[in-house]
Amino acid sequence: LPKAPVITTPLETVDALVEEVATFMCAVESYPQPEISWTRNKILIKLFDTRYSIRENGQLLTILSVEDSDDGIYCCTANNGVGGAVESCGALQVKMKPKITRPPINVKIIEGLKAVLPCTTMGNPKPSVSWIKGDSPLRENSRIAVLESGSLRIHNVQKEDAGQYRCVAKNSLGTAYSKVVKLEVEVFARILRAPESHNVTFGSFVTLHCTATGIPVPTITWIENGNAVSSGSIQESVKDRVIDSRLQLFITKPGLYTCIATNKHGEKFSTAKAAATISIAEWSKPQKDNKGYCAQYRGEVCNAVLAKDALVFLNTSYADPEEAQELLVHTAWNELKVVSPVCRPAAEALLCNHIFQECSPGVVPTPIPICREYCLAVKELFCAKEWLVMEEKTHRGLYRSEMHLLSVPECSKLPSMHWDPTACARLPHLDYNKENLKTFPPMTSSKPSVDIPNLPSSSSSSFSVSPTYSMT
């Protein structure tokens, strides 16, 4: 007798590993024999699809090599024309051993920054990810965390974080290990022991001692008054990432000695500096009201004008001499924007050397004033018209209130380079000689108050005056 189809063994959930075989069984009793069709996620599986094998009159569906994309709901439908079609469904869960799809890589990181070591995984059930540092499991803390993605994040990296790391992905089917990678922690150069200042007698030997550390180990260089040390012997030793440098000097003049520790991080360098003054007892007679100290110029405004690493006098009448003197120059330079192209560089050179005077680092640090001749060259040659206007404005109080703080130098009160060549400072930017001066028309009603000498030429000068310039 005809009999409608009945599925005697309903489909069950099948767990299968990737690349293995998975079979669904759909046993049907009916008469006549039914037609059995299969669907995956409601899409018909074609009989000729070579990834599947359908046997036993359609009652067995075999996936020949499971892929992770095969998971889903599989249904068999039996129909023989008697009664209605019947259906049974079951799920395929593709199980997968852990696999590390994005393994960690070697990392170099600067101390204090954030490091992230990637470890992206696949697997079903979802693998749990842990990390091993050296030979021990890595413990998470407020700085160190394993992210949801499996990556390891280390905030505020410390020296002790350096070492060998690997990630471990684990689920019920197995465990996968990444290759071992290296986290290298680099540390900015830092001075541990700064050289000490000394007040010594002329002709003494002094040893300056500077110790620095960093990863990689820094190199130490010594600077004397802004230039590489030309004399003296340097001894160096390195132990446990600490470099020790000793500079032995024979003292014949005062100076500012700077120890500079430098190390490299990729393309960038980090430096640390410490300075010491060597003064000679009885070297300079203290000048009245010269309260201040010598320091290397490290501002911006006068960079192009002052010698590199120039030793300048910082006046402690100001609460913050560096800032105050820098900003007074800046204010004045804004006033200079309107002056002629002949005057401006000369005035800038005068201004910078007047506010940031060269410094003699004796027992009492002493500012070295500009030589009278250079001041007069600016006043009566380069900036004759402008100087007259400026003096008039100052007398009439037309400048903004801080301009009087600048106190434009009175040339006549400055020492002459003829009296004592070491008692005053030259302006190397004024690169001209007497021959050039003869081509200028008279600037003022009277001759310059002193003979302007042949000023020493300077190859690094930023401008020169030639007969083609006119100041009228």
């Epitope: 300075a275 320091a295 609460a319 560096e322 800032e323 820098e326 900003l327 007074l328 209130s401 703080l405």
Partner: antibody, heavy 124, light 107 residues
Framework: EVQLVESGGGLVQPGGSLRLSCAAS????????IHWVRQAPGKGLEWVAS????????SYADSVKGRFTISADTSKNTAYLQMNSLRAEDTAVYYC?????????????????WGQGTLVTVSS | DIQMTQSPSSLSASVGDRVTITCRAS??????VAWYQQKPGKAPKLLIY???SLYSGVPSRFSGSRSGTDFTLTISSLQPEDFATYYC?????????FGQGTKVEIK
């Protein structure tokens, strides 16, 4: 993150000494000056001393000159205020504050970060 | 020493008011003036530096200005969290000096 943390305050007898510390983190010590500012109970702010760590140049208010010494250990990023011959009028909350050099700004900088303060009480 | 004379020493105002505090320097201090806000039991906070530059993170209702040796802090529309003591400071000349403070209270 920039932080200044003072410590070392407490109760001391007149004529006694205390050493205050100001531990700095999150910035380059050598690009800053460190200042101590105090505030007596119910009063205003009074600047006490400063140090420019790059040059170790120091300055002091007249009221503390000769009694207080400011210093810095750049390797530890810490500034100190050694207070000797303390007087009742030195009783105050002592703050350390930093001033950072920003040359390209061409502006006078203020004290942009302050510590939480440490109380110094001078009393017999 | 440079005197920074701050006025008024205290004021009462309501939320939404425009508040002005002035400071006069006894001699030229260029633009080296900063303004700070201090709440009871807390450290001062920088509001304005270089006379008129707003410090980062400070609301734009605060502004500073300068006219010669007179400096002004203005709060354009007072908010509840602005009730505090305000100090001016000059940092050009040694020693650094502060104004005596202005306490802004709720009316």
């Amino acid at each position: 993150e920039v932080q200044l943390v003072e410590s070392g305050g407490g109760l001391v007898q007149p004529g006694g000494s205390l050493r205050l510390s100001c531990a700095a983190s999150g910035f380059t010590f050598s690009s800053s000056s460190i200042h101590w500012v105090r505030q007596a109970p119910g009063k205003g702010l009074e600047w006490v001393a400063s140090i420019s760590s790059s040059y170790s140049s120091t300055s002091y208010a007249d009221s503390v000159k000769g009694r207080f010494t400011i210093s810095a250990d750049t390797s530890k990023n810490t500034a100190y205020l050694q207070m000797n011959s303390l007087r009742a009028e030195d009783t105050a909350v002592y703050y350390c504050a930093r001033k950072y050099y920003r040359w390209r700004h061409n502006k006078y900088q203020g004290f942009d970060y302050w510590g939480q303060g440490t109380l110094v009480t001078v009393s017999s | 020493d440079i005197q920074m004379t701050q006025s008024p020493s205290s004021l009462s105002a309501s939320v939404g008011d425009r508040v002005t505090i002035t400071c006069r320097a006894s001699q030229s201090v260029s633009s080296a003036v900063a303004w700070y806000q201090q709440k009871p039991g807390k450290a001062p906070k920088l509001l304005i530096y270089s006379a008129s530059s707003l410090y980062s993170g400070v609301p734009s209702r605060f502004s500073g200005s300068r006219s010669g040796t007179d400096f002004t802090l203005t709060i354009s529309s007072l908010q509840p969290e602005d009730f505090a003591t305000y100090y001016c400071q000059q940092s050009l000349w040694y020693p650094v000096t502060f104004g005596q403070g202005t306490k802004v209270e709720i009316k």
